[in-house]
């Protein structure tokens, strides 16, 4: 069955969406699963149907019960079910976990909680935030657009928030409030802007023709385990798979962590056979992650023989 | 610039499959490393997996074993098959390009509209 939990506090504006999906021109009618009674679109009504919302303005515990909606389309039905609890405002500060929505973790570096369900609302910021039912103040929180950012994350920050928003319809403000738990991973690893070690910037390298040659293209990207971290080897703006020259190839090296815990990768280009035309190459290495890209350039020079004359 | 159009996504019921394409226009595509990220409603864009040449491509843990990332030249276009799809893999999922310039920033990236994926029964 296409169904979904949804769940709200008495008094607070509550909307659901239909949990099947249908183009905005589809109709979609909507109706009381226990008496089959169908849901007014009249927006007088407290509780009301929008295409594919169903509002509760405000919310009641008797609303409480499973509703269909049915998404009609010139050629076919489809049917879902929206189960809705609407709970009595606890007298204490304890939120029970029936009312909690999922669980976030954060860390040092990334410290955002998003206040749950507000897509669904004609909400204006800002967002007021609340932990553990205090008002967060001072400048570590900031409020931004539909999340919560905390500056210097640090165990203590872990427990519940919550926060509160105004829905506006037809220029009536109800209150919603939403919460979920915060955990904080002990993460000492980071990203950061790729970090090319070698090859210098416009490097020039000296060959020797008929020899073999290695470029290596080594780079840095943070601390710690990498979500995603590249380095490849380019032949004129063209990748190295695709250049079509057998005998020049990348080979993957050693993935470096060294003792300051920087998370490195190298990648060897190796060309065989140096020969004149490789000269005239442009050779791009570019170390990708999600931070985005770096590119350094290199250039072939042919080294002079050494003269040996005494 | 490249402008790229991904199609491919739709309803699908858990355990199910969908091929997702990104079509990228202009003659960029050989020196361009390819990716897919995704954003579910109230989340963050994430990363699910880049394709750096024909050999290298890297996936975020949660899609690993499952989704597999591949190019054509030929075709200029980057594909994204999902397997065993989940009810969390739902979400709009974007083709992103990177290529060109001395230094990129995620930013900077050229992204496509998205494409929704809904993985329900």
């Known amino acids: 069955k296409f169904s979904k939990q949804s769940w709200g506090l008495e008094n607070e504006a509550l909307i659901v969406r239909c949990p099947r999906q249908g183009k905005p021109s589809y109709t979609v009618d909507w109706y009381y699963s226990q008496t089959n009674k169908s849901i007014p679109t009249q927006e007088r009504n407290r509780v009301f149907a929008s295409g594919q919302l169903l509002k509760f303005l405000p919310a009641a515990v008797a609303d409480s019960g499973i509703y269909t909606c049915i998404v009609r389309s010139p050629t076919f039905n489809r049917t879902g079910y929206a189960n809705v609890t609407i709970y009595k405002k606890q007298s204490d500060c304890n939120v029970p976990d029936y009312l909690m929505y999922s669980t976030v973790s954060g860390s040092e570096k990334n410290s955002k909680i998003y206040c749950p369900t507000i897509d669904l609302y004609n909400w204006t910021a800002p967002l007021e935030w609340f932990k553990n039912c205090q008002a967060l103040q001072g400048s570590r929180y900031r409020a931004h657009k539909s999340f919560l950012v905390i500056d210097n994350v640090m165990t203590e920050d872990a427990g519940d928030y919550t926060c509160k928003f105004i829905h506006n319809e037809n220029g009536a403000n109800y209150s919603v409030t939403a919460t979920r738990s915060f955990t904080v991973k002990d993460e000492q690893g980071f990203s950061l802007f790729p970090v090319i070690g070698a090859p210098a910037q416009n490097e020039i390298k000296e060959v020797e023709i008929g020899k073999n040659a290695n470029l290596t293209c080594s780079a840095c990207f943070g601390k710690g385990t990498q979500f995603l971290a590249a380095v490849l080897w380019q032949l004129n703006g063209t990748k190295i798979t695709d250049f079509g020259e057998p005998r020049i190839q990348q080979e993957e090296g050693q993935n470096q962590s060294f003792s300051n815990g920087l998370a490195c990768l190298d990648m060897v280009l190796r060309i065989a056979d140096v020969k004149e035309e490789d000269l005239l190459l442009q050779y791009d290495c570019l170390a990708l992650n999600l931070h985005g890209l770096r590119r350094h350039t290199v250039r072939l020079s042919r080294k002079n023989p050494i003269d040996h004359h005494s | 610039e490249v402008q790229l159009v991904e199609s491919g996504g739709g309803l699908v019921q858990p355990g199910g499959s969908l091929r997702l394409s990104c079509a990228a226009s202009g003659n960029a595509f050989r020196s361009t490393v390819m990716g897919w990220f995704r954003q579910a409603p109230g989340k963050e864009r994430e990363f699910v997996a880049v394709?750096?040449?024909?050999?290298?491509?890297k996936y975020a843990d949660s899609v690993k074993g499952r989704f597999t990332i591949s190019a054509d030249n030929s075709k200029n276009t980057a594909y994204l098959q999902m397997n065993s799809l989940k009810p969390e893999d739902t979400a709009v999922y974007y083709c992103?390009?990177?290529?060109?310039?001395?230094?990129?920033?995620?930013?900077?990236?050229?992204w496509g509209q998205g494409t929704l994926v809904t993985v329900s029964s």
């Open positions: 394709i750096i040449d024909s050999r290298t491509t």
């Open positions: 992103a390009a990177v290529g060109g310039a001395t230094t990129v920033t995620a930013s900077e990236w050229d």
